[in-house]
Interface confidence: low
């Protein structure tokens, strides 16, 4: 999916109001310095591409993020503010339902969510200082 035409300010607002807090809740009990940020992004569409990938694509050692509260809110924000996004996700969602796994918060998942926090912060960096 090409995120170029998303309403970035609305997605930013959704992140600041709820998603950020859900990410913090997921990471509670973890030191902020525990994981190094190894994933980055260089513009807003690129950030959303990386955020989508880390949030919804199962990885080795972490297959359970898509059912987390922050993931569901992320999906809702993208569906509302990115034209045509929800249509591209129908097949992926059906596949996810077939694959339902027991929820386990592994160290790999914590690391992955730490990367997500970094990507979201990068997405939200100020465009310019206020004049």
């Amino acid at each position: 999916y090409d995120f170029t035409n998303c309403d970035f300010e609305k997605i930013k607002a959704a992140y600041l109001s709820t998603i950020s807090k859900d990410l913090i809740t997921y990471m509670s009990g973890t030191k902020s310095t525990e994981f190094n940020n190894t994933v980055s992004c260089s513009n807003r569409p690129h950030c959303l591409t990386e955020i989508q990938s880390l949030t919804f694509n199962p990885t080795a050692g972490c297959a359970s993020l898509a059912k987390e509260m922050f993931a569901m809110k992320t999906k809702a924000a993208l569906a509302i503010w990115c034209p045509g996004y929800s249509e591209t996700q129908i097949n992926a969602t059906q596949a996810m339902k077939k694959r339902r796994k027991r929820k386990v918060t592994t160290n790999k998942c914590l690391e992955q969510v730490s990367q997500l926090q970094g990507l979201w912060r990068r997405f939200n960096r100020p465009l310019l200082k206020q004049q």
Partner: antibody
Framework: QMQLVESGGGVVQPGRSLRLSCAAS????????MHWVRQAPGKGLEWVAV????????HYADSVKGRFTITRDNSKNTLNLQMNSLRAEDTAVYYC???????????????WGQGTMVTVSS | SYVLTQPPSVSVAPGQTATITCGGN??????VHWYQQKPGQAPVLVVY???DRPSRIPERFSGSNIGNTATLTISRVEAGDEADYYC???????????FGGGTKLTVL
Amino acid sequence: QMQLVESGGGVVQPGRSLRLSCAASGFAFRTYGMHWVRQAPGKGLEWVAVIWYDGSATHYADSVKGRFTITRDNSKNTLNLQMNSLRAEDTAVYYCVRAPQWYLSAEAFDLWGQGTMVTVSS
Amino acid sequence: SYVLTQPPSVSVAPGQTATITCGGNLIGSKLVHWYQQKPGQAPVLVVYDDSDRPSRIPERFSGSNIGNTATLTISRVEAGDEADYYCQVWDHSSDHVVFGGGTKLTVL
């Protein structure tokens, strides 16, 4: 590893043209804004031009506007600078430079090529 | 057009603190980046967004930006810090990148 390699520099007579190229590797070229920065011998850094990550916008220093054209080919990971009507004051090392691209703001230049020398002389 | 003013040269003894300034009208409202350039080499980013530091840059390098002056501070200066230093901003009124004239840091 991430790198930018410039080519196309050389000696050219005033009024003639030259085309510089920059080959990018080791990073997602299509997601970065790209700039040219030049440095005349013994002088400071002078910004020349920028092209946005998707090629949708370009901006030029007043000193080169109307003479230089910046282009990019994201399918080939290349950046170009077409320099026409060259003048003696265009003599400089030309650097290809990468910057993360955010709408309406220039980020820091976090990756530089080693530069290619352009000499304009009769 | 927007102008950035740097002192041409700054001298400091090893182990001391070097302060390089970059003056501009209300520069505190802009994001300032700093580069180090050694002879015959391409510039290297040492501080970005006023005060952030790339991971490979020592903690001795720091920056601040308020009012009409941005400052690059290098603490516990070493001989290897001898170089030219440039400040840079984006002038969004003209859509131009602007560099300061550069400051030559000499380690005595």
